[in-house]
Amino acid sequence: IRAEKAMVDGSWLDLAKRSKLEAQPFAHLTINATNIPTGSHKVSLSSWYHDRGWAKISNMTFSNGKLIVNQDGFYYLYANICFRHHETSGDLATEYLQLMVYVTKTSIKIPSSHTLMKGGSTKYWSGNSEFHFYSINVGGFFKLRSGEEISVEVSNPSLLDPDQDATYFGAFKVRDID
Amino acid sequence: IRAEKAMVDGSWLDLAKRSKLEAQPFAHLTINATNIPTGSHKVSLSSWYHDRGWAKISNMTFSNGKLIVNQDGFYYLYANICFRHHETSGDLATEYLQLMVYVTKTSIKIPSSHTLMKGGSTKYWSGNSEFHFYSINVGGFFKLRSGEEISVEVSNPSLLDPDQDATYFGAFKVRDID
Amino acid sequence: IRAEKAMVDGSWLDLAKRSKLEAQPFAHLTINATNIPTGSHKVSLSSWYHDRGWAKISNMTFSNGKLIVNQDGFYYLYANICFRHHETSGDLATEYLQLMVYVTKTSIKIPSSHTLMKGGSTKYWSGNSEFHFYSINVGGFFKLRSGEEISVEVSNPSLLDPDQDATYFGAFKVRDID
């Protein structure tokens, strides 16, 4: 009986450990600044790091600029987007800016895209100021199904701060779907 | 056998409960306004409450102004920083401000400090306005090792809002490292 | 013995699954714009969706404009509040605004209300500009007891963005109280 109990304990420990880790996908993706689009229109950001510096991914997939869900569950999603401009890098096209982020979910089965979270601000960035900076943070708790894709759109991509501590987004699974 | 089963169930319940709680360190630290530095330069904030009001800590350590990780894991880190100025508290040294927060990680083994998250905004706080306020929120998911330290730096510390609901930072463990 | 072991495994699997799901209440509530108060004073927002679009709730209760905790625990709370104004919707009463959010906790046992988190900004929304936008995000980790209520107060409710991706708040349980 003791041997059986040990076996129960052992197998349970494995199962618990394994299931716990398997049950918790996550990603933290940081901007890849070598490929940021120009212009001031709203664009989907497709270049992100997933395996250097703070960037990491587990039990999720990064493909074609989208974070793909591999496991059904409730996830906490977040994004931090920093915009900046220094006069030494050129002029602003306009001093009145709409600096925005949109975190969207795309379902492949039903080809449709929906915004989960948005944030930002209209700003007056005077051409007379040497330096401008503004950050947006959004976060929320969402049900995601395997195969669904998360992407990030921003306005004025040419103003993005390319640092890994500045412009990033991520997700981590909190619980299963009942 | 029933006794053995009860023993298995009982020990497992204890183990599950214990391991679950042990596996989830957290901290929510609120600003200690009795010791906020003056000036407008970037400074590390070292005075935080960990055991009064909303402030709390478990399975992490607060020492020398830093939040110390005691347990390897993936953590969600966050900070909320509020800046404010009322004309009754005197004039601003300058109307053009850079209000910023930097959440940094320091590794003792390899003495180095790296910024995990940053946020903020450049602001024009006109002397003609009676009151000014601005808040920053940042959050992200990071791998932390035992012994690593989390600290918060801000610009213009003299403008910090000293309320516990305004200026705080924290962390909670989400999962183990594989 | 094998039968007993199967019974142990089976009951454990049920228990683990059941306890895991039961241990993780959550809510994501989105603004119900059909009933937003007018004016510029600080008001408690009482109309939220809990079961349409992104809005959902489990093991928590939404009643009388408040999110009620049904299970003791440590929760991560968050709110995202967007304000906007377009000139086509009329003039602003004042160009100098204080756009704020307060996430509060009310204890029924001891009838008192306390602010857990606040954020926002003073803004100058010039009448010369066609469109204005501003978002606030706050988040933090708090101990909540069964029966406690979470509510959201904002200034200038008439300026709230009514989209479900714009104005929302939520909570999810991270761990039990020791």
């Epitope: 890098s89 040497e130 | 053009y96 | -």
Partner: antibody, heavy 118, light 111 residues
């Protein structure tokens, strides 16, 4: 290094139009306002206006609004100024110019002389 | 439009002496903690060259004999000591506000 190369001198009849060009190199054409300045013989400098080549935004001094039209060809990194309904008052040297990295007009084209004569 | 008035219209200065040129703006050209006033030198048949930017900053490659000062509405360009090569016309310019404007110019002659 930043260079602004302007087109050659123009001789035009009153009432006609001319289109001056300014070919840029050594920097990202779409990220700076490209300015135009007029100088009549023996006179001072007058700011005409500027174009932001990315989206093609323009700004003008009031007196030149009906006189000058600023355009840009992003693919050729070239800015243009068309002067219409020419009169003798439009006889001048026209400069294209760009600000320095820290303000002030640090970069100038060599100038294009426009002569309006019957 | 901001009007810039330069004085004197012309001046003659002996070699090695100090030359001072004034520029007065019809309204302040200060914003964001800086003065948006610049100084240029122009020799006949040449485009202008930037000497001083933001009221007091010496442009790269410009001799330290040139200096600028002032704020809000009153600005000064100083050349000390003057050299023969400095004979030219000097212009002030503001870019604090559209449309940008130039002063009428000051012609410097070396005696």
């Amino acid at each position: 290094q930043v260079q602004l190369q302007q087109s050659g001198a123009e001789l035009a009849s009153p009432g006609a139009s001319v289109k001056l060009s300014c070919k840029t190199s050594g920097y990202t054409f779409t990220t700076y306002w490209l300015q135009w300045v007029k100088q009549r013989p023996g006179q001072g400098l007058e700011w005409i206006g500027a174009i932001y080549p990315g989206p093609g935004n323009t700004k003008y001094t009031q007196k030149f609004k009906d006189k000058a039209t600023l355009t840009a060809d992003k693919s050729a990194s070239t800015a243009y100024m068309q002067l219409s309904s020419l009169t003798s008052e439009d006889s001048a040297v026209y400069y294209c110019a760009r600000r320095g990295s820290r303000r002030g007009i640090a970069y100038w084209g060599q100038g294009t002389l426009v002569t309006v004569s019957a | 439009n901001i009007v810039l008035t330069q004085s004197p219209a012309s001046l003659a200065v002996s070699l090695g002496q100090r030359a001072t040129i004034s520029c007065r703006a019809s309204e302040s050209v200060d914003s964001y903690g800086r003065s948006f006033m610049h100084w240029y030198q122009q020799r006949p048949g040449q485009p202008p060259t930037l000497l001083i930017y933001l009221a007091s900053n010496l442009e790269s490659g410009v001799p330290a004999r040139f200096s600028g000062s002032g704020s809000r509405t009153d600005f000064t360009l100083t050349i000390d000591p003057v050299e023969a090569d400095d004979a030219a016309t000097y212009y002030c310019q503001q870019d604090n506000e559209d449309p940008y404007t130039f002063g009428g110019g000051t012609k410097l002659e070396i005696k």
